[in-house]
């Protein structure tokens, strides 16, 4: 009898107790494989769910979430409220990310900014609630002949660029040396 059941196609159910064993699934039910003993009730996409694919006698309905919500779980089993970028969903609703954290999506939690110094790099662009920090090249990458894998960033904030710091330090040293020699030269003139 089991072999007879396997002849029942998807869209039907099988009953070994009858001579004619295959029966069509009733409305709003389905069987996605052959030989099933019962038809499953179609999923209904109601409330925060909306129908992505209608149910048929051989496949279940598929749901999405209405605007302002996103799917969670296998086969969109739950809908969770969207938040803005720079926020995370808490039990009390959407809350801004704390300083030092960011979220660039409408879902999920706020994550800590990347710690550039752990990779021996410097901060090229500061982080925000919506965006992670951008790490720049390490000071070692600036030595002559060294090639940097990090492309130059289009925007650099003064005080954060190692190139500028290096340039200012060099300029200061040269100016100090010039002043030193000027002072010495002035003293020599006075002695004469």
């Amino acid at each position: 009898l089991q072999d007879l059941c396997s002849n029942c196609p998807a869209g039907t159910f099988c009953d070994n107790n009858r001579s004619q064993i295959c029966s069509p699934c009733p409305p709003n039910s389905f069987s996605s494989a052959g030989g099933q003993r019962t038809c499953d009730i179609c999923r209904q996409c109601k409330g925060v769910f909306k129908t992505r694919k209608e149910c048929s006698s051989t496949s279940n309905a598929e749901c999405d979430c209405i605007s302002g919500y996103h799917c969670l779980g296998a086969e969109c089993s739950m809908c969770e409220q969207d938040c803005k970028q720079g926020q995370e969903l808490t039990k009390k609703g959407c809350k801004d990310c704390c300083f030092g954290t960011f979220n660039d999506q409408k879902r999920g939690i706020c994550r800590p900014w990347t710690n550039c110094s752990l990779d021996g790099k410097s901060v090229l662009v500061n982080g925000t609630k919506e965006r992670d920090v951008v790490c720049g090249p390490s000071p070692a990458d600036l030595s002559p002949g060294a090639s940097s894998a990090t492309p130059p960033a289009p925007a650099r904030e003064p005080g954060h660029s190692p190139q500028i710091i290096f340039f200012l330090a060099l300029t200061s040293t040269v100016v100090l040396f010039l002043l030193f020699f000027l002072v010495l030269d002035y003293k020599d003139d006075d002695d004469k």
Epitope: G11, R18, C22, P24
Partner: antibody, heavy 114, light 107 residues
Framework: QVQLQESGGGLVKPGGSRKLSCAAS????????MHWVRQAPDKGLEWVAY????????YYADTVKGRFTISRDNAKNTLFLQMTSLRSEDTAMYYC???????WGQGTALTVSS | NIVMTQSPKSMSMSVGERVTLSCKAS??????VSWYQQKPEKSPKLLIY???NRYTGVPDRFTGSGSATDFTLTISSVQAEDLADYHC?????????FGAGTKLELK
């Protein structure tokens, strides 16, 4: 919305042949089994044939077995009923319906008469 | 084959009256019975499936009940637009079979 539109009916002589079609739209045709059901003038409904979604399973009423052939073209969303050796008792309105038997077409009338 | 017997063959009712239509199966068909409404020159429309489930968009004055061999369609307060033939059918086993129908007429 779900729509089923039958065509191909008309006047046929006894012993003749005819092919009915049912054009489906508004649902995923390839995921549904389909039925043909007929209704003789001033009579009740009589189930004629069933074909599963993938054409692997076919059933016929005893009254049409060996004379009628049900088939489908999922690429064209169309159901067919090829009828041969027609008799006067085959005169009826022929309806196609999804296997849930929830939606029916408007029907196509077949008259078998000399 | 399972035989579905409907009674009465026809009935005349006044608007607002309660209508009860009967359908008996020659053998146990579980709850695999549907009721259809067919207006003159139109195709059948599904009202009730699974003996008691109202199909989408069907007014709640239509109620189905019963199981095994005895089934009933009740119209709690008949309206003028309910003038039609009513068919019961079983999908418990092939061949699917239908009753001869009950014609509902208005007085």
């Amino acid at each position: 919305q779900v729509q089923l539109q039958e065509s191909g009916g008309g006047l046929v002589k006894p012993g003749g042949s005819r092919k009915l079609s049912c054009a489906a739209s508004g649902f995923t045709f390839s995921e549904f089994g389909m039925h043909w059901v007929r209704q003789a003038p001033d009579k009740g409904l009589e189930w004629v044939a069933y074909i599963s979604s993938g054409s692997s399973t076919i059933y016929y009423a005893d009254t049409v077995k060996g004379r009628f052939t049900i088939s489908r073209d999922n690429a064209k969303n169309t159901l067919f009923l090829q009828m041969t050796s027609l008799r006067s008792e085959d005169t009826a309105m022929y309806y196609c319906a999804r296997d849930w038997v929830d939606y029916w077409g408007q029907g196509t009338a077949l008259t078998v008469s000399s | 084959n399972i035989v579905m017997t409907q009674s009465p063959k026809s009935m005349s009712m006044s608007v607002g009256e309660r209508v009860t239509l009967s359908c008996k199966a020659s053998e146990n068909v579980g709850s695999y019975v549907s009721w259809y409404q067919q207006k003159p020159e139109k195709s059948p429309k599904l009202l009730i499936y699974g003996a008691s489930n109202r199909y989408t968009g069907v007014p709640d004055r239509f109620t189905g009940s019963g199981s095994a061999t005895d089934f009933t369609l009740t119209i709690s307060s008949v309206q003028a637009e309910d003038l039609a033939d009513y068919h019961c059918g079983q999908s418990y086993s092939y061949p699917l079979t239908f009753g001869a129908g009950t014609k509902l007429e208005l007085k």
